[in-house]
Interface confidence: low
């Protein structure tokens, strides 16, 4: 069986002039997935990204995330790219007020 992920991109304040953007994938099966941040369509270096473990979410499916820190005001240049079981999609950073959330960093 294959269950596609739901992908959600959020933003949080990291430090002055910077924000952390987090791309979360959840509810997918099997566990094999690729999440990666891109800037202007080019994959970011892996050492500028932080990945969460792929974990079971209790429903027989899995969840994971990838985060990176970017300059506030450049959000439109960044997208989260997802590949799962032969399907792929691209997800932009939402515009609007920066939410003050705990950073992964």
């Amino acid at each position: 069986r294959t269950v596609p992920p739901m992908v959600n991109v959020t933003r949080s304040e990291a430090s002055e002039g910077n924000i952390t953007v987090t791309c979360r994938a959840s509810g997918f099966y099997p566990w094999n997935i690729t999440l990666s941040w891109r800037q202007d369509g080019v994959s970011l270096s892996h050492d500028t990204q932080q990945w969460g473990d792929v974990l079971p979410d209790g429903n027989g499916t899995y969840q994971t995330w990838v985060a990176t820190r970017i300059c506030q005001g450049e959000e439109q240049r960044f997208t989260c790219y997802m590949e799962h079981s032969g399907n792929h999609s691209t997800h932009p950073v939402p515009s609007g007020k920066v939410l003050v959330l705990q950073s992964h960093w």
Partner: antibody, heavy 119, light 108 residues
Amino acid sequence: QVQLQESGPGLVKPSETLSLTCTVSGFSLTTYGVHWIRQPPGKGLEWIGMIWTDGTTDYNAAFISRVTISVDTSKNQFSLKLSSVTAADTAVYYCARKGHGYYYAMDYWGQGTLVTVSS
Amino acid sequence: EIVLTQSPGTLSLSPGERATLSCTASSSVSSSYLHWYQQKPGQAPRLLIYSTSNLASGIPDRFSGSGSGTDFTLTISRLEPEDFAVYYCHQYHRSPFTFGQGTKLEIK
């Protein structure tokens, strides 16, 4: 079954462009990405670059000024072009499929094609 | 760039013995992005282990991988004649994505 087959001229003159194709079967070009890797005779492996399922490319910075990787879904082919070649580009060139969820690992490889750069 | 140093360069063992191959990175590598390949003479490499410790499809369980940070290990618990080959570690953590120089496993 999954197969990848590299093809192209075995001999290229210095300063010319090396052009190779990777013809695939057993999987869809729209659902798998492909890497290009090379191996000089008697030496180790060197990653050249890759193309994602949506056509986006990532290149090794050592080649970025002279490499192009592309896809032609109608022909079931990926291509590699490397310009301004020198004798140092003599190598066996491989294409390899990027496995799903394998964190960019290469799960199937072509048999490789030897390209010699010489006048 | 991250340099991967494999040791030993050549390992001479007999069938039935245990083989331990080392891969040391010049800086830390995420375990998700450290892979091992096997290459026999005249053949293309094949994926052996991905993400440090996961066996690729069709690979027998006498192969195992471990490690984290800068130190990674490939172990073959009981060597079979078909295991004698060159083994490469490969990191996809930081560009340029690099391979080790290889360890040649030869019959003693």
